[in-house]
Interface confidence: medium
């Protein structure tokens, strides 16, 4: 921000009023009126361009200092060239000294050139020369000079003529100040430069109404230059929830609008299923029947628990079951949708019933499934099970209520049994096979059916109670269909895979595991 | 020594034209300021135009804008008064006068000149 | 305009007295004043500039004063020579005035 200039004297503004003192008295230094632009202007002027040594002095008034540290005089006027008086006017000059004197008091009348210091010889940019004269074009030089730090109570500037034609036409003398500034939502007061130039004053900023710093943020700090810039931001302050910046200021939300935290963003509309919040809100309350999960933005609109699964199917496979859903027709506003499948059984003969989490297995585990099916395994034969599958959502748990939808299947088969081939040689094959723990209580025997490949006229059983056999009196190198199925006492089980199994050739004889 | 020698006085009627002239010697004519000022018979001083040293600006009496024209031609050292219009209360001794403001010892020029070097004048009277 | 109004319009003085002649300006023109002295059938010829500047060559017992509004001529021992008619003229503004004259004969 551009420096504040505090004016200590301005003599062009006072309209011949100041009552200067010249040295010496009534030569020298005249204090003339001239008319520019129609106007009347005063000045103060000497032209003693013909009379040899001239040591003409004219000094302010006294200028008190007040906070001043360092002054800056800007001066405006105007030199004739030498070149324009006849004869070149041997002793004329272009050029005057400008002097300081601090002091605590005015000394009047009393004038000692001696307590003044010397600022610097003024030169002009421009002379005036005769044409210029004639046309009354004023060549107008303007000069700063800068003083500090002064420590007295007031100053008199001075001005020493040794034989120029000049003319003073302005005298400001002022000091600078870093002015009133509002910046990132900071107010920083008005700071008296410093009179050092390398130096810059730090200046703590207070934030405006309804402004905060933010959280792990720097407190807001600027630095007064000399010339009276603020430099260096640092930090800034924020508005905080329920306030959003309005040019330099923060300003209360509007109703129907919030913001929840402090941040550089605007107030946001109040989201989708919320009751109008009042002004300066940091959120918006949901509407009955929705909510609002803990981990949600308040920008998020609230939402509600889903529907049930749409639409189950359980479709059964000996001892496994897949169970098929559709999501939920209204998913409450949410995408974060997951499934969970528990399981009952019921035993057809007592028709008691209990949960069957732990005697099943499940493809994936069944809580917080986020597809639509899951594989149910090691299902009991001969028992009734229903499925239920259950939609859940981040607002789930701030309800009572749940969202599921049920299948029931009964399994009326054991599961096929799992078959290797554990040996063979060129006349025999042993065979194992394994069903799951929960079913084999159910098991009977086991009837082991084979036949040569190709052969479709005959084939041999053999029952077995055990979970092998070997079978023998088979034809070397010779390819085998073999079946193992599962006997309960309410009759046949699910029938394995059929397997093809091969003996070993007579030049390979001996008993060979695989 | 500056000389200022004026012409082209006489007798002339109303609505009449007259062209005067102002020959001058002895100083840098370019270099000065040139004005006509007449003094009507028994009465005091009038200023009546100026013109700047190198032909501009020109300024006129309120009596005589628009019937005078000012003119100055620097490589003859001559200034001259075009009178067109004449009435009876233009008649009076038209002087030529000079000002140089190098003899002027003021940092600011006044906003007007004042007359350093006169010529004797011409007479110019205007009657039917 | 700027009128120039000269007082007395003539006086008469004897050969050494100190005469004193004023000008008074219609509104503020600062030192912006000439004094001419003509005599019958001459030309004007310049006395004073900047209303207390002497011209070149004209002698010292010519002296003049004041700013403003008010001004004066002043000879401090009237010589012969001085009988004539004195004008003031302003030239602050562009339409320069002179005063109507002060006619100065001898006692």
């Known amino acids: 921000a551009q420096g504040k200039e505090v004016v200590l004297l301005d003599f062009a503004a006072a309209g011949g009023e100041l009552g200067w003192l010249t040295h010496p008295y009534g030569k020298g230094w005249d204090l003339m009126q001239n008319i520019m632009n129609d106007m009347p202007i005063y000045m103060y002027s000497v032209c003693n361009v013909m009379s040899g040594d001239q040591d003409n002095w004219l000094r302010t008034n006294w200028v008190y200092r007040g906070e001043a540290e360092r002054i800056f005089i800007e001066l405006k006027f105007t030199v004739r060239d030498c070149n324009s008086f006849p004869g070149g006017a041997s002793s004329c000059k272009e050029t005057f000294n400008l002097y300081y004197a601090e002091s605590d008091l005015d000394y009047g009348t009393n004038f000692q050139k001696r307590l003044f210091t010397k600022i610097d010889t003024i030169a002009p940019d421009e002379i005036t020369v005769s044409s210029d004269f004639e046309a009354r074009h004023v060549k107008l030089n303007v000069e700063e000079r800068s003083v500090g730090p002064l420590t007295r109570k007031g100053f008199y500037l001075a001005f020493q003529d040794i034989g120029a034609c000049v003319a003073l036409l302005s005298v400001r003398v002022y000091y600078k100040k870093c002015p009133e500034l509002l910046q990132g939502l900071a107010h920083f007061p008005e700071t008296i430069a410093g009179s050092d130039a390398p130096s810059l004053a730090t200046v703590a900023g207070t934030c405006v109404d309804h402004a905060v710093v933010p959280p792990g943020g720097e407190e807001p700090r600027m630095h007064c230059a000399v010339d009276g810039e603020w430099l260096v931001p640092i930090g800034q302050c924020l508005c905080q929830a329920g306030y959003e910046k309005v040019e330099d200021a923060c300003q209360a939300c509007s109703p129907g609008f919030f913001k929840f935290e402090a941040s550089e963003s605007p107030c946001l509309e109040c989201p989708e299923h919320t009751l109008p919040s009042p002004e300066g809100a940091t959120s918006c309350e949901c509407e009955e029947g929705f909510f609002r999960a803990p981990q949600d933005p308040a920008s998020m609109p609230c939402t509600r628990p889903p529907s049930a699964p749409h639409y189950l199917t359980a479709v059964g496979m000996g001892a496994k079951v897949e169970l098929r859903w559709t999501p939920p027709q209204d998913s409450g506003g949410r995408e974060d949708i997951v499934y969970s499948v528990t399981c009952e059984q019921c035993w057809p003969e007592s028709g008691e019933c209990g949960p069957c989490e732990a005697s099943v297995r499940y493809s994936e585990p069944p809580h917080g499934l986020t597809r639509t099916s899951v594989t149910v395994s090691d299902l009991e034969p001969h028992m009734n099970y229903t499925f239920t599958v259950e939609a859940r959502n981040g607002v789930s748990g701030l309800v009572t209520s749940r969202s599921f939808r049920t299948a029931s299947v009964s399994i009326n088969q054991t599961e096929p049994p799992k078959v290797r081939l554990e040996g063979r040689s060129t006349t025999s094959l042993s065979v194992s096979w394994s069903i799951p723990p929960p079913q084999q209580s159910r098991v009977w025997k086991y009837e082991v059916t084979y036949r040569k490949k190709g052969d479709s006229n005959s084939y041999n059983v053999r029952r077995t109670e055990g979970f092998s056999v070997t079978l023998d009196d088979l034809a070397p190198d010779t390819t085998y269909l073999v079946q193992v199925q599962a006997l309960t006492q309410e009759g046949q089980g699910a029938g394995s895979k059929v397997h093809e199994f091969q003996t070993l050739s007579p030049e390979g004889s001996g008993n060979l595991a695989v | 020594e500056v000389q200022l020698l004026e012409s082209g006085g006489g007798l002339v009627q109303p609505g009449g034209s007259l062209r005067l002239s102002c020959a001058a010697s002895g100083f840098t004519f370019s270099h000065y300021m040139m004005a006509w000022v007449r003094q009507a018979p028994g009465k005091g001083l009038e200023w009546v135009s100026r013109?700047?040293?190198?032909?501009?600006?020109?300024h006129y009496a309120d009596s005589v804008k628009g019937r005078f024209t000012i003119s100055r031609d620097n490589s003859k050292n001559t200034l001259y008064l075009q009178m067109n219009s004449l009435r009876a209360e233009d008649t009076a001794v038209y002087y030529c006068?000079?000002?140089?403001?190098?003899?002027?010892?003021?940092?600011?020029?006044?906003?007007?000149?004042?007359?350093?070097?006169w010529g004797q004048g011409t007479l110019v009277t205007v009657s039917s | 305009d700027i009128q120039m109004t000269q007082s007395p319009s003539s006086l008469s003085a004897s050969v050494g007295d100190r005469v004193t002649i004023t000008c008074r300006a219609s509104q503020s023109i600062s030192t912006w004043l000439a004094w001419y002295q003509q005599k019958p059938g001459k030309a004007p010829k310049l006395l004073i500039y900047?209303?207390?500047n002497l011209h070149t060559g004209v002698p010292s017992r010519f002296s003049g004063s004041g700013s403003g509004t008010e001004f004066s001529l002043t000879i401090s021992g009237l010589q012969p020579d001085d009988f004539a008619t004195y004008y003031c003229q302003q030239y602050q503004s562009y339409s320069r005035t002179f005063g109507q004259g002060t006619k100065v004969e001898i006692k």
């Open positions: 900047k209303a207390s």
């Open positions: 006068a000079g000002y140089d403001s190098g003899y002027d010892y003021v940092a600011v020029a006044g906003p007007a000149e004042y007359f350093q070097h």
């Open positions: 013109i700047g040293p190198s032909g501009g600006p020109t």
